[in-house]
């Protein structure tokens, strides 16, 4: 098949680069003959510092190859990506990032966790790859629902909270208003729609403080809202159905003992919020004395019978509906309730199986007379909104 032309000279015998092979192997290469170079698995074709997918050289009329022999260079996955709120350890050896090298990602203990085992290998495609085939580094997700609080004490009939009791508690300050919210991720706050409705078009005017017990404490962690998402089924001024909103923060907050998200309820959590089961609500709202609390107060309150609650409010405020998206809590005898200024805060329950606290309700509305007998506090039933919450968080 050789094309011997008097005017052309044969090209030099190509020598395969280390960790590579040549095809086809011929006794002699003349004008227009070609060869390709293939690298062993774990090695890549490099022309200088530039990677190539394939390499073919052609013998020219002057007896030279049209391009120089490439190298087969060991795949180098390069330094692994940094892991926010975690770190990476080199398992194979210090800073070894070449083919088959192993690294181990891990999260800052106590406050962050990852779903995978965090072990990644430098594979032949040049990417750090997990055992599940994932090319992206893992994510250190904030731990949720850890609290030093044990069940025991609008907040009426409450007791002062201690550090670490309600690390998800967030203070929302407008120019003239105050409300609450609950951190549910490191950059999302759950609250009541009515508490932030006026701010929906001017999110940046909402001042968000967390990591505090004293309402006026100067030692707070400041967060700024990027966007407010009001539930599309909420109609301001026409009842409190779908009284739920999410605030996306501009930046992620660092999770620690005094700032931590509350968990969202698992599907099985409905069984933990039946009548007479106890939840806990905290806030800086009006106390029995009718003044805003200086210190974060909390109260442990039982879930009330839904039918009883519905009947009470039908009588008390005809036209005001207690819907299936709400749950009521309080004592028939009164004395324990949330009140004005607590709106948007979380009614939380302890999940006995996971030993984590989850948000079951959002402080929404109630009788003007906080803590009055037979007049329950009404809370947005969070479990009904898990798909809505997950949809907003995943899309924004």
């Amino acid at each position: 098949h050789h094309h011997h032309h008097h005017a052309s000279r044969p090209c030099p015998d190509p020598t395969a680069p280390p960790n590579g092979s040549i095809s086809p192997v011929q006794a002699i290469y003349v004008l227009k003959d070609r060869f390709s170079v293939f690298c062993k698995t774990g090695f890549e074709l490099l022309q200088g510092s530039v990677p190539l997918k394939s390499f073919t050289a052609v013998c020219q009329k002057d007896g030279s190859w049209d391009r120089p022999m490439p190298e087969c260079s060991i795949i180098d996955c390069g330094p692994p990506d940094d892991l926010p709120n975690g770190h990476v350890d080199y398992i194979t050896g210090p800073e070894v990032t070449t083919y088959k090298a192993v690294i181990q990602y891990s999260c800052e203990e106590t406050f962050y966790t990852m779903s995978s085992n965090g072990k990644y290998v430098c594979e032949a495609d040049g990417f750090w790859t997990s055992s599940k085939g994932e090319k992206l580094p893992p994510v250190c997700e904030p731990v949720c629902g850890l609290s030093t609080h044990t069940i025991g004490g609008r907040i009426v009939g409450g007791q002062p909270a201690k550090p670490g009791d309600f690390p998800w508690q967030v203070l929302l300050l407008g120019q003239t208003t105050a409300a609450a919210g609950a951190l549910i991720h490191d950059n999302w706050v759950l609250t009541a729609a009515h508490a932030v409705y006026e701010k929906r078009m001017a999110a940046s005017s909402l001042n968000i403080r967390m990591g505090i017990l004293k309402r006026l404490s100067p030692h707070y962690t400041q967060a700024w809202p990027e966007e407010i998402f009001i539930h599309e089924g909420y109609t301001h001024g026409a009842g409190f159905d779908n009284d739920i909103a999410l605030i996306k923060l501009k930046n992620k907050v660092t999770i620690n003992g005094s700032i931590m998200p509350v968990c969202l309820p698992r599907k099985e959590a409905a069984s933990l919020m039946r009548t007479d089961f106890t939840g806990t609500v905290a806030g800086w709202g009006l106390t029995q004395k009718g003044l805003l609390a200086r210190n974060l107060m909390f109260v442990d309150i039982p879930i009330a019978d839904h039918q009883k609650c519905t009947a009470v409010y039908e009588k008390l405020y005809p036209g005001v509906r207690v819907s299936a998206n709400m749950l009521c809590a309080g004592l028939e005898t009164g004395g324990k309730d949330s009140c004005r200024g607590d709106a948007g805060g979380a009614l939380v329950f302890l999940d006995n199986e996971t030993q984590r606290w989850f948000v079951g309700g959002i402080v929404s509305w109630g009788s003007i007379n906080c803590g009055a007998a037979d007049q329950y506090g009404v809370y947005t039933k969070v479990i009904n909104y898990i798909p809505w919450i997950e949809n907003i968080i995943s899309n924004f």
Partner: antibody
Framework: DVQLQESGPGLVRPSQSLSLTCTVT?????????WNWIRQFPGNKLEWMGY???????SYNPSLKSRLSITRDTSKNQFFLQLNSVSSADTATYYC???????????WGQGTTLTVSS | QTVLTQSPAIMSASLGERVTMTCTAS???????LLWYQQKPGSSPKLWIY???KLASGVPVRFSGSGSGTSYSLTISSMEADDAATYYC?????????FGAGTKLELK
């Protein structure tokens, strides 16, 4: 024929992020080669910024590594540059290019001029 | 990184004159991985010479390139008006890829 075409905003404010797109026609960016971003400053100095290879791996100029990200969309045969925290020193003409790897295969876009100014 | 120094920065030549410009690397570069580009005002750089001495398609044979190690040059055997431009050398022997600052060739 292989063609590369840059597109971008023209003007960016200091401290903001710059995003540029290179649309490639006549050749698939996954077929081979490294797809580069190069910039030319007002005094005509050329600087290689980085590349994304046919496999999606990236290599960056160490002087820009902390601010630079090059990504791609293979379905649109496009690759992108994102440069964070820009300053007036980033004012330049930005080119996307395939640089010849010892063969006569070298293509550049026509360049897009970027001014960083408040 | 490998610094490429081009000299002279600016030069002028008469029609028919022989022109040589140099590109000096701060560390050795494989001759396979040294390129020259030509750029005219308002245009993108054009590949002119690759692998130190191979002319890109469409480049007149009056151009030639040579060199090895740290010393490379581009030569025009007989200057023509169309050759007035800025010429840049580029190495891709090792990362980061680096360009020389350019030699601006003007017509006398």
């Amino acid at each position: 024929d292989v063609q590369l075409q840059e597109s971008g905003p023209g003007l960016v404010r200091p401290s903001q992020s710059l995003s540029l797109t290179c649309t490639v026609t006549g050749y698939s960016i996954t077929s081979d080669y490294a797809w580069n971003w190069i910039r030319q400053f007002p005094g005509n100095k050329l600087e290689w910024m980085g590349y994304i290879s046919y496999s999606g791996r990236t290599s960056y100029n160490p002087s820009l590594k902390s601010r630079l990200s090059i990504t791609r969309d293979t379905s649109k045969n496009q690759f992108f540059l994102q440069l964070n925290s820009v300053s007036s020193a980033d004012t330049a003409t930005y080119y996307c290019a395939i640089i010849s790897t010892a063969v006569d295969f070298d293509y550049w876009g026509q360049g897009t001029t970027l001014t960083v100014s408040s | 990184q490998t610094v490429l120094t081009q000299s002279p920065a600016i030069m002028s030549a008469s029609l028919g004159e022989r022109v040589t410009m140099t590109c000096t690397a701060s560390s050795s570069v494989s001759s396979s991985y040294l390129l020259w580009y030509q750029q005219k005002p308002g245009s993108s750089p054009k590949l002119w010479i690759y692998s130190t001495s191979k002319l890109a398609s469409g480049v007149p044979v009056r151009f030639s390139g040579s060199g090895s190690g740290t010393s490379y040059s581009l030569t025009i055997s007989s200057m023509e008006a169309d050759d007035a431009a800025t010429y840049y050398c580029l190495q891709y022997n090792r990362s980061p890829l680096t360009f020389g600052a350019g030699t601006k060739l003007e017509l006398k």
